[in-house]
């Protein structure tokens, strides 16, 4: 066969639905690979073919569009499961084209199970909720284009296994679930089903999320430099360890970038000669704010090293501020001979 | 297309037990809950207990807690609801009733089961 | 356990009438509750599923209404064949508990 644009597997896009519900699978070349729609490439000519590898094999085969009730179809630029298999779990293949062009990309589809509380291996998207920041709503995800409008479906919402009713500060509203003021105690998993009749049968969407609530932007404030401090002298002979470190609380903020740096007499650490190691680690809190504690090193640390300026930056979408550690060389106790001889008027 | 079989008719003495089966077919057995609901001779509808066969769950009324046992064989597709100390009272058709979430979406053709001595 | 008590018991109506049927439960259902469909000698059908959804298959005559503790299944023109008792069953709290039944027969 001719030459073909092969995108390869497009791993990026692991897709994974449950097992016994419907799926549609956009083509991905479509989305992500070409710079044209379906309807532009059928209007020229162009056609779009699907096939698959089951998962453990090797050989490439067409896609079956001869089940019983059209388990499996082609519609435009979708492939529709009505419902999934656990076998049909595989790479799958979509390939656009005609006798002078050919385009195709592979994704790997995983049919998964769950259990009957909607546990599962499946990756779960997270929505962060802003702590008692008033009304807040999540949607029952990825589940346009299963149904027209004119059909109505039912919703119903879990916390974990458990239905949602009768919760203080919970409401399910249709594909909505409220939230009336988010607290710590509203952490967890949540799953919609949509229950839906198509040509006289009734089919489910199982949608899990995990809800995590997050630091207010009310209460945000700039970073917060707890060390070093006015407080702590770093005082040290020249041949000691120096250690000071840098903690500082960052306010949780929606994609904000936190930073923590070091300057040794305004240059960053990599750009001095000094034998200075820098280890870093971060702790969260239960509201995801963030505490950032970089830790300066010197092993041998010399008197010129005594005299330098130890600054510690911290920078976030609120602010940036910077803290100089106070250090000092220890003036050596006087030897008890010497102190005698002076004592004595000794020249 | 969904349908539950369900074993034949059973007449069965005052203190003993018994075991109806509910075979299962067009549709994933694994995914969906089993239930278990059973119908006194002109009466009403009484809920049993269910079983999720992915994982085993089972949830019973209080009723029947300690009496009736709800298992379920994947490789079959078949549940069972065994009942035991059979009284005369317990004389009634017996029916599976398979539901994706809690309603009882398809039921079995239900199993008579006559306590006679 | 939840008690659901429905009414009438029985009734007798002409071909195209509208039948209404009401179910009250013991304690608020938050519309977790489905309504069956059952002929005689015959299981039981899902007609109506979370108070108001239509099950697969199901005619549209039939239709569900409610909230909190009262709720009514509604055939808005008899037909023969809707001979049956209808059954409510809450699915809100287990153990799942259904009415006493509704006859409906026609005149």
């Known amino acids: 066969s001719e030459r073909c644009d092969d995108w390869g597997l497009d791993t990026m896009r692991q897709i994974q639905v449950f097992e016994d519900e419907p799926a549609r699978i956009k083509c991905p070349l479509f989305e992500h690979f070409l710079k044209f729609n379906y309807s532009t490439a059928h209007s020229a000519g162009l056609t779009l073919i699907w096939y698959w590898t089951r998962q453990d094999r090797d050989l490439e085969e067409p896609i079956n569009f001869r089940l019983p009730e059209n388990r499996i179809s082609k519609e435009k630029d979708v492939l529709w499961f009505r419902p999934t298999l656990l076998n049909d779990t595989g790479n799958y293949t979509c390939m656009l084209r005609n006798t002078t062009y050919c385009s195709k990309v592979a994704f790997p589809l995983e049919v998964v199970q769950k259990d009957s509380c909607f546990n599962s291996p499946m990756k779960l998207p997270v929505h962060k909720l802003y702590i008692e920041y008033g009304i807040q709503r999540i949607t029952c995800p990825n589940v346009d284009g299963y149904f027209p409008s004119s059909v109505k479906p039912t919703i119903t919402w879990y916390m974990g296994c458990y239905k949602i009713q009768n919760f203080n500060n919970v409401i399910p509203e249709g594909m909505n679930l409220s939230f009336l003021i988010a607290l710590i105690s509203n952490n967890g998993n949540y799953t919609c089903v949509v229950t839906y009749p198509e040509n006289g049968r009734t089919f489910h969407l199982t949608r899990t999320l995990t809800v995590k609530v997050v630091g207010s932007p009310k209460n945000a404030v700039p970073p917060v430099i707890h060390s070093p401090n006015d407080h702590v002298v770093y005082e040290k002979e020249p041949g000691e360890e120096l250690l000071i470190p840098c903690t500082v609380y960052f306010s949780f903020l929606m994609d904000s970038r936190n930073e923590v740096w070091w300057t040794i007499d305004g240059k960053k650490p990599d750009d001095i000669t000094i034998d200075v190691t820098i280890n870093e680690s971060i702790s969260h809190s239960r509201t995801e704010d963030e505490t950032r504690t970089q830790i300066l090193s010197i092993k041998k640390v010399t008197s010129e090293d005594l005299k330098r300026s130890y600054v510690c930056h911290a920078r976030s979408a609120k602010g940036e501020v910077a803290k100089a550690a106070k250090v000092k060389q220890k003036v050596p106790a006087p030897r008890y001979t010497v102190e005698l001889a002076c004592g004595f008027g000794a020249t | 297309q969904v349908q539950l079989v369900q074993s034949g008719a059973e007449v069965k003495k005052p203190g003993s037990s018994v075991k109806v089966s509910c075979k299962a077919s067009?549709?994933?057995?694994?995914?969906?809950?089993m239930n278990w609901v059973r119908q006194a001779p002109g009466k009403g509808l009484e809920w049993m207990g269910r079983i999720y066969p992915g994982d085993g769950q089972t949830h019973y009324a209080q009723k029947f807690q300690g009496r009736v046992t709800i298992t379920a064989d994947k490789s079959t597709s078949t549940a069972y609801m065994e009942l035991s100390s059979l009284r005369s009272e317990d004389t009634a058709v017996y029916y599976c009733?398979?539901?994706?979430?809690?309603?009882?979406?398809?039921w079995g053709q239900g199993t008579l089961v006559t306590v006679s001595s | 356990d939840i008690q659901m008590t429905q009414s009438p018991s029985s009734l007798s109506a002409s071909v195209g009438d509208r039948v209404t049927i009401t179910c009250q439960a013991s304690q608020g259902i938050n519309n977790y509750l489905n309504w069956y469909q059952q002929k005689p000698g015959k299981a039981p059908k899902l007609l109506i599923h979370?108070?108001?959804g239509l099950h697969a298959g199901v005619p549209s005559r039939f239709s569900g209404s409610g909230s909190g503790t009262d709720y009514t299944l509604t055939i808005s023109s008899l037909e023969p064949e809707d001979v049956a008792t209808y059954y409510c069953q809450q699915y809100s709290i287990l153990p799942w508990t259904f009415g006493g039944g509704t006859k409906v027969e026609i005149k």
């Open positions: 009733g398979e539901g994706y979430l809690d309603p009882m979406d398809y």
């Open positions: 979370y108070t108001s």
């Open positions: 067009g549709y994933t057995f694994t995914s969906s809950w």
